[in-house]
Amino acid sequence: RPSFSLVEDTTLEPEEPPTKYQISQPEVYVAAPGESLEVRCLLKDAAVISWTKDGVHLGPNNRTVLIGEYLQIKGATPRDSGLYACTASRTVDSETWYFMVNVTDAISSGDDEDDTDGAEDFVSENSNNKRAPYWTNTEKMEKRLHAVPAANTVKFRCPAGGNPMPTMRWLKNGKEFKQEHRIGGYKVRNQHWSLIMESVVPSDKGNYTCVVENEYGSINHTYHLDVVERSPHRPILQAGLPANASTVVGGDVEFVCKVYSDAQPHIQWIKHVEKNGSKYGPDGLPYLKVLKHSGINSSNAEVLALFNVTEADAGEYICKVSNYIGQANQSAWLTVLPKQQAPGREKEITASPDYLE
């Protein structure tokens, strides 16, 4: 992990207007482990689409298929969870769309439709036809995995029939679910075969089993609830940026750092420098200089422009972004060639992003 001796002090000082950053919460796509997931990049007129996960370039492999504007993940695992982005490169500009993928056996988006149609789930039988419990509406039970934002209402349903009319009880993680097990308790609507929990919190995560039984038998069905926590996150940088670059002595060059942050980000451009002829301080850490940072007197902090470069400008340039939650950094190298050599844009290489979980 990088540690630095700063030639100039750095602080958490985000002062740039937020309009340049995607502040809104990204859309969440939910999958259970083992399921396949397909997401379409919601950008128009894309000549070339590139994909990233948690700021790192995403390429095809035996489980990840990239076809046109579609991303397919086969046999999803929890490790596939994260912040994804597709970037559409056009002749004049580029645009990025972000979305979250949540793969967990604790996942959901609660069945919040009103129970206006619930009465028909309560099936009355001819008193002579004794029958063990059975499910009357399996369609309403297909979605076993529910990922629900904290503070939302969750409803689980187990519409059943039988003769005599079965009773229903609920278990949480295999044990009797009691009212005192959660703040605010819960509601059971026997007429609608439903369990309702309002204002869910992270401690509500777990397996919920309805047990439907009469004297002729018992059936059960288990739902898994994940409470998706809402909290701001640290910045994420677009993969491949800044990109390595080369230019001749006297030439100009630009480094670009694209930032995703839902809390105001502070951008710094930092370079390794020498102090008293040494690149490292007495503590063995490299000397760094802040070349540019976001603030009132700084125009577009996402771009570092270098003019009339000299050989001394060659080296590693770090884009470091922080908000009050955390940090991210990626770097690129500048190669300065003698005047007679023609410059060429190098292949974009992402510095290994040590800030990712």
């Epitope: 985000p14 909290s231 701001p232 922080s322 908000n323 009050y324 800030y355």
Partner: antibody, heavy 113, light 107 residues
Framework: QVQLVQSGAEVKKPGASVKVSCKAS????????IHWVRQAPGQGLEWMGA????????SYNQRFKVRATLTADTSTSTVYMELSSLRSEDTAVYYC??????WGQGTTVTVSS | DIQMTQSPSSLSASVGDRVTITCRAS??????LNWYQQKPGKAPKLLIY???NLADGVPSRFSGSGSGTDFTLTISSLQPEDFATYYC?????????FGGGTKVEIK
């Protein structure tokens, strides 16, 4: 789940130093700033500073820059806040917080001769 | 430093009331504002981040609005557990200053 557990109450004499610890668990320690906020009796909240455990970056409220020192030990997922040259007006509850989202239980520091 | 001014400093209300607390920043902080609830002897609890986003586990009766310099925390229907002190905080630039607090008491 995310937890921040702070060290116990301290009673100090004016001029002394105090070192309060904040042990984090339930998340990747290096990925979030730990902030320190204090609250004098019957008063409001005051931000003191923050540290990023991944690289030790610190940021201080100018009011505390001379007297406060924040450090992080990644091997134990613990952050420390040391306040020197204590005076009676430093009597307060000191909180650590992960990015202001999760808070420790608070440590009462009493400065009295 | 950015100054945060809360008003009122205290208010009395009844269960079921709609309560509004305002916070003004001394300069533009865009949407970089958090709201907290604090009960006696307890740590503050994050209610709203980014001026309008409800934090984890916070009931939907709480809402935040505003940007720039003027912000509002609204409790649509006050519940018994909502009697507490509320603070706003600038999270745009250091020092991350807090408002003076608004104490919500039972009428």
């Amino acid at each position: 789940q995310v937890q921040l557990v702070q060290s116990g109450a301290e009673v100090k004499k004016p001029g002394a130093s105090v070192k309060v610890s904040c042990k984090a668990s339930g998340y990747t320690f290096t990925n979030y700033y730990i902030h320190w906020v204090r609250q004098a009796p019957g008063q409001g909240l005051e931000w003191m500073g923050a540290i990023y455990p991944d690289n030790g970056d610190t940021s201080y409220n100018q009011r505390f820059k001379v007297r406060a020192t924040l450090t992080a030990d990644t091997s134990t997922s613990t952050v420390y806040m040391e306040l020197s040259s204590l005076r009676s007006e430093d009597t307060a509850v000191y909180y650590c917080a992960r990015a202001f989202t999760y808070w420790g239980q608070g440590t009462t520091v009493t400065v009295s001769s | 430093d950015i100054q945060m001014t809360q008003s009122p400093s205290s208010l009395s209300a009844s269960v079921g009331d709609r309560v509004t607390i305002t916070c003004r920043a001394s300069e533009n902080i865009y949407g970089a504002l958090n709201w907290y609830q604090q009960k006696p002897g307890k740590a503050p609890k994050l209610l709203i981040y980014g001026a309008t986003n409800l934090a984890d586990g916070v009931p939907s009766r709480f809402s935040g609005s505003g940007s720039g310099t003027d912000f509002t925390l609204t409790i649509s229907s006050l519940q018994p557990e909502d009697f507490a002190t509320y603070y706003c905080q600038n999270v745009l630039s250091t020092p991350y200053t807090f408002g003076g607090g608004t104490k919500v008491e039972i009428k």
